[in-house]
Interface confidence: medium
C-alpha cells in the first residue's frame, strides 16, 4: 500500500502591483497532479508581516490571494497543497511548505521619514493628512504623498499639498468616491539632494477617522415644571442621524456641571424653579454602529438662557 504524496505549489511569489501595501500572493499548481484529476486540490496559505506573532491562515482552491500589508516591514508567506480525505480514501494529505518573502529595500535612515502623520476625514467628506518633516532633514527635502484604495486603477499622487517654508507638510484630498469601509493606503516618500529619504506607509479605513461638524440649532423647551428638553440638529453632510453619538455639557447658574452621552438629538434635564441661568454645548462623534473609532467634533456654539423665569413654555421662539 503506497503512501500518497503531493508536491507543494510551484512558483509561489508575492507580487507588488504598486498599490502601496495591497499585495498579490500567487502560485501555480503542484507538479504531478495527474493522479488526482477527479479531485479538487486545496491550498493552505499562511502569511504575516515579519515581526507579527500570528499568521493569517486561508484555505482556498484558487491560485492567488490578495490582502493588505504594512510595507514598513517585510512580509513572509508559506503555502502547501492539501488533498482532502475524499481524494485519498483516508486522511487528508499535505505537501511540504513552499515559502517566500517580500520587502521593499529601505532607503535612508529611519529619522528621515515623516513624523507625526495625522489624517482626519472631516464630516465624512474631506480627507486631510498632515505630517512633520523628518528629524534633521534639510529644507531641500520634499515629501510626496501617494494613495490608493480598491476602485482606483493605480496609486494617485496628492495634487493639493499644504506647504510650510516651501516644504510639503500635508495633503488636501479630492472627493474620494466609494472609499469608506475598505483599506485606504498611503505612502509618503521624499527626495533630497543630500541624502536618501525613508518612505513611510500607512493604512486605515476612512470611516474610523471621521471628525464630524458640531451640532447646530440648539434650543430649550420647558416640558414640565421640573424638566427642560434640550434639542439640537445634526450638521449638514453625508452622515446619517443614526450614526451619531453626542456628548452634552450643561452648566446651571455657573456652578453645576452636568455631562452626558446620548444617542438622540434630545436630552431631558431635571431642574429646579430656582434655576436662573442654563447654558449647554454639544459635540458629536460617529458611533459604533457606523465605525470602529472616530474623533469628537468641536463643541457647538454655546446656547444660554438667563435673566428670565425658565418656566416659560418655549424659551427661544
Amino acid at each position: 500500500d503506497t503512501e500518497i504524496k503531493v508536491n507543494p505549489p510551484q512558483d509561489f511569489e508575492i507580487v507588488d502591483p504598486g498599490y502601496l501595501g495591497y499585495l498579490y500572493l500567487q502560485w501555480q499548481p503542484p507538479l504531478s497532479l495527474d493522479h488526482f484529476k477527479e479531485c479538487t486540490v486545496e491550498y493552505e496559505l499562511k502569511y504575516r508581516n515579519i515581526g507579527s506573532e500570528t499568521w493569517k491562515t486561508i484555505i482556498t482552491k484558487n491560485l492567488h490571494y490578495k490582502d493588505g500589508f504594512d510595507l514598513n516591514k517585510g512580509i513572509e508567506a508559506k503555502i502547501h497543497t492539501l488533498l482532502p480525505w475524499q481524494c485519498t480514501n483516508g486522511s487528508e494529505v499535505q505537501s511540504s511548505w513552499a515559502e517566500t518573502t517580500y520587502w521593499i529595500s529601505p532607503q535612508g535612515i529611519p529619522e528621515t521619514k515623516v513624523q507625526d502623520m495625522d489624517c482626519v476625514y472631516y464630516n465624512w467628506q474631506y480627507l486631510l493628512c498632515s505630517w512633520k518633516p523628518g528629524i534633521g532633514v534639510l529644507l531641500d527635502t520634499n515629501y510626496n504623498l501617494f494613495y490608493w484604495y480598491e476602485g482606483l486603477d493605480h496609486a494617485l499622487q496628492c495634487v493639493d499639498y499644504i506647504k510650510a517654508d516651501g516644504q510639503n507638510i500635508g495633503c488636501r484630498f479630492p472627493y474620494l468616491e466609494a472609499s469608506d469601509y475598505k483599506d485606504f493606503y498611503i505612502c509618503v516618500n521624499g527626495s533630497s539632494e543630500n541624502k536618501p529619504i525613508r518612505s513611510s506607509y500607512f493604512t486605515f479605513q476612512l470611516q474610523n477617522i471621521v471628525k464630524p461638524l458640531p451640532p447646530v440649532y440648539l434650543t430649550f423647551t420647558r416640558e414640565s415644571s421640573c424638566e427642560i428638553k434640550l434639542k439640537w440638529s445634526i450638521p449638514l453632510g453625508p452622515i446619517p442621524a443614526r450614526c451619531f453619538d453626542y456628548e452634552i455639557e450643561i452648566r446651571e447658574d455657573d456652578t453645576t456641571l452636568v455631562t452626558a452621552t446620548v444617542e438622540n438629538e434630545t436630552y431631558t434635564l431635571k431642574t429646579t424653579n430656582e434655576t436662573r441661568q442654563l447654558c449647554f454645548v454639544v459635540r458629536s462623534k460617529v458611533n459604533i454602529y457606523c465605525s470602529d473609532d472616530g474623533i469628537w467634533s468641536e463643541w457647538s456654539d454655546k446656547q444660554c438662557w438667563e435673566g428670565e423665569d425658565l418656566s416659560k413654555k418655549t424659551l427661544l421662539r
Epitope: Q125, V216, Y217, L236, G237, P238, D301, K302, Q303, C304
Partner: antibody
Framework: QVQLVQSGAEVKKPGASVKVSCKAS????????MNWVRQATGQGLEWMGR????????DYNQNFKDRVTITRNTSISTAYMELSSLRSEDTAVYYC????????????WGQGTLVTVSS | EIVMTQSPATLSVSPGERATLSCRAS??????????MNWYQQKPGQAPRLLIY???RQGSGIPARFSGSGSGTEFTLTISSLQSEDFAVYYC?????????FGGGTKLEIK
C-alpha cells in the same frame, strides 16, 4: 436668547449715505455670518452681502456696484451696513440676519430699519 | 447670478388642506451632495422666518407640517394641513453662489 437689534428709521436725501447698525446678543458674535437683506415696500427680498465677523471676510452683491460697505466691531458685537449715493429706489426696509453657515440659511433676523430716500 | 422662480404667485387654499409651493432655480444649487436651498415665511410687518434649510431640513422650532423636498433645480415646500397662522408670503432662496438670490414669493391666501 438670540437678539439682533437694529438702529432706528432714517430719512435721507438723494445722493446721501446711510449707515445702519445691528447689535447682536445671546450668542457668540464671531461664530455666525451676518447678512444684510433689503425689502422695498410690497416687494421681495434682495440680498446685499454678508460678513464673517471672525476674520472680516466679506461678500457683496455686485448689483450694488460698490455702493455698499459692510463692517463689524467684534468688541461690541455689532455689524454695520453703509449704502452711499442713495436714490429713491433705495427706499426699503433693511434687515440684518444671522446665518450659521452658507448652507444653513439665515435663522435670526433683526426687526428691520426703514430707510426713506426723498428730496 | 442664479435666478429663482416661484410658482404660483398666489395660491388659494382652505384651512386644513395641503399646500404645495414650487421653486425653480436657473441652474443647479447642489454642491457637496447638499442642496443650498432655503424657504422662509413672512407675515405683514414682520421679518422673514426660516422654515427649511438645505432643501429638506426643518429650522429650529418649525412645526412638522412644514416639509421641503427636491434637488438640483426643482424644489417644493409642502404644508400638510394648513392652519390659520400659515397664511403668509413664502420665499425660496439659494445660497450656493454669491449673490444669494430669492424667489419673487408665493402669497398663500385663505380660500
Amino acid at each position: 436668547q438670540v437678539q439682533l437689534v437694529q438702529s432706528g428709521a432714517e430719512v435721507k436725501k438723494p445722493g446721501a449715505s446711510v449707515k445702519v447698525s445691528c447689535k447682536a446678543s445671546g450668542y457668540t458674535f464671531s461664530n455666525y455670518l451676518m447678512n444684510w437683506v433689503r425689502q422695498a415696500t410690497g416687494q421681495g427680498l434682495e440680498w446685499m452681502g454678508r460678513i464673517d465677523p471672525y476674520d472680516g471676510d466679506i461678500d457683496y452683491n455686485q448689483n450694488f456696484k460698490d455702493r455698499v460697505t459692510i463692517t463689524r466691531n467684534t468688541s461690541i458685537s455689532t455689524a454695520y451696513m453703509e449704502l452711499s449715493s442713495l436714490r429713491s429706489e433705495d427706499t426699503a426696509v433693511y434687515y440684518c440676519a444671522r446665518g450659521y453657515g452658507t448652507a444653513y440659511g439665515v435663522d435670526y433676523w433683526g426687526q428691520g430699519t426703514l430707510v426713506t430716500v426723498s428730496s | 447670478e442664479i435666478v429663482m422662480t416661484q410658482s404660483p404667485a398666489t395660491l388659494s387654499v382652505s384651512p386644513g388642506e395641503r399646500a404645495t409651493l414650487s421653486c425653480r432655480a436657473s441652474e443647479s444649487v447642489d454642491n457637496y451632495g447638499i442642496s443650498f436651498m432655503n424657504w422662509y415665511q413672512q407675515k405683514p410687518g414682520q421679518a422673514p422666518r426660516l422654515l427649511i434649510y438645505a432643501a429638506s431640513r426643518q429650522g429650529s422650532g418649525i412645526p412638522a407640517r412644514f416639509s421641503g423636498s427636491g434637488s438640483g433645480t426643482e424644489f417644493t415646500l409642502t404644508i400638510s394641513s394648513l392652519q390659520s397662522e400659515d397664511f403668509a408670503v413664502y420665499y425660496c432662496q439659494q445660497s450656493k453662489e454669491v449673490p444669494w438670490t430669492f424667489g419673487g414669493g408665493t402669497k398663500l391666501e385663505i380660500k
